[in-house]
């Protein structure tokens, strides 16, 4: 799976979309999880309604919401009041049994609020060991990153 980068502004909401084949994943609940390290487990943040037929109902866990358009095949996650600590690698998942298929790998980047003059050092950037190949950026203006390109400016 390629990694798609979604950029949001601190303090605002960020909407992440994960398209999928609606027939292939028919009847399956979905989930949004946070990757603990590039090779680590993916920790469940929120999942769609226990009844698949009610997947269109928005479910919240803290400031994160999930809703699933099962007919159109789009899972939507909303991160409300985006904070620097929300930045990182996530996955959209399709659940079957106790297993999960990855629908999309997502890198959330939190940008400074241009109206907020606090120290930009509070914002998150990937460390030297973190690089995401074939990343694709999704925000108001999209661009695809070159292979191997680090999707953030250096911290220094």
């Amino acid at each position: 799976h390629n990694t798609t980068v979604f950029q949001g502004v601190a303090g605002q909401s960020l909407q992440v979309s994960c398209p999928y084949d609606s027939m292939k994943h028919w009847g399956r609940r979905k989930a949004w999880c946070r990757q603990l390290g590039e090779k680590g487990p993916c920790q469940r943040v929120v999942s769609t309604h226990n009844l698949w037929l009610l997947s269109f109902l928005r479910r919240w866990n803290g400031s994160t919401a999930i809703t699933d358009d099962t007919l159109g095949g789009t899972l939507t996650i909303t991160l409300r009041n985006l904070q620097p600590h929300d930045a990182g690698l996530y996955q959209c998942q399709s659940l079957h049994g106790s297993e999960a298929d990855t629908l999309r790998k997502v890198l959330v980047e939190v940008l400074a609020d241009p109206l907020d003059h606090r120290d930009a050092g509070d914002l998150w950037f990937p460390g030297e060991s973190e690089s995401f190949e074939d990343a694709h950026v999704e925000h108001s203006i999209s661009r695809s990153l070159l292979e191997g390109e680090i999707p953030f400016p250096p911290t220094s």
Partner: antibody, heavy 123, light 107 residues
Framework: EVQLVQSGAEVKKPGESLKISCKGS????????IAWVRQMPGKGLEWMGT????????RYSPSFQGQVTISADKSISTAYLQWSSLKASDTAMYFC????????????????WGQGTLVTVSS | DIQMTQSPSSVSASVGDRVTITCRAS??????LAWYQQKPGKAPKLLIY???SRQNGVPSRFSGSGSGTDFTLTISSLQPEDFATYFC?????????FGQGTKLEIK
């Protein structure tokens, strides 16, 4: 009426190749996973792997990975199971089965089965 | 892999009897379990899915129960056509695995 019709019985020699088929009808073939299940003579059922004909996404049981190839041609609603070099131990009945997800359960079960293809490998 | 163990491996019973077959998973599988019936020379037939849901067209004398690791298939009043081999199967994780089967014979 949903039907899975498998190709006929085969008698082969060790080392030969073989491709058996499973043709679906009465439903949208591309939209359901198809599994292959082995039953050796007088024995139980073994799940070999599964394929989604819509995009040919395939999963194998570790026991069968590298031993067989599962494929599908959605244009003719047919799934395949093939061997490049048969062994005597491949002698068995092979079933294809449609995998259906039940929406209040979010897992999948084999709701329709083919009639089976008997493969005999003997020198 | 999850191991599925059925008991008994065979059972003799008469028409009208109540029969219970059990299936134990080597680890918890929630309610992701199916029961199949197979007659000689035929393909298996789905009877029960999600541990307790009857497949369309399956007679009400067949019922399933259990969750976690222990499951049962009950036939409340045996009919002549019920003499067959029954398999449980976990749908929790890959690879999918089946029990070794329980052969139901006429006493």
């Amino acid at each position: 009426e949903v039907q899975l019709v498998q190709s006929g019985a085969e008698v082969k020699k060790p080392g030969e190749s073989l491709k058996i088929s499973c043709k679906g009808s009465g439903y949208s073939f591309r939209s359901y996973w198809i599994a292959w299940v082995r039953q050796m003579p007088g024995k139980g059922l073994e799940w070999m792997g599964t394929i989604y004909p819509g995009d040919s996404d395939t999963r194998y049981s570790p026991s069968f990975q590298g031993q067989v190839t599962i494929s599908a041609d959605k244009s003719i609603s047919t799934a395949y199971l093939q061997w490049s070099s048969l062994k005597a131990s491949d002698t068995a009945m092979y079933f294809c089965a449609r995998s259906r997800t039940f929406y209040y359960d979010s897992s999948d079960y084999f709701d329709y089965w083919g009639q089976g293809t008997l493969v005999t490998v003997s020198s | 892999d999850i191991q599925m163990t059925q008991s008994p491996s065979s059972v003799s019973a008469s028409v009208g009897d109540r029969v219970t077959i059990t299936c134990r998973a080597s680890q918890g599988i929630s309610s992701w379990l199916a029961w199949y019936q197979q007659k000689p020379g035929k393909a298996p037939k789905l009877l029960i899915y999600a541990a307790s849901s009857r497949q369309n067209g399956v007679p009400s004398r067949f019922s399933g129960s259990g969750s976690g690791t222990d499951f049962t298939l009950t036939i409340s009043s045996l009919q002549p056509e019920d003499f067959a081999t029954y398999f449980c199967q976990q749908a929790d994780s890959f690879p999918r695995t089946f029990g070794q089967g329980t052969k139901l014979e006429i006493k």
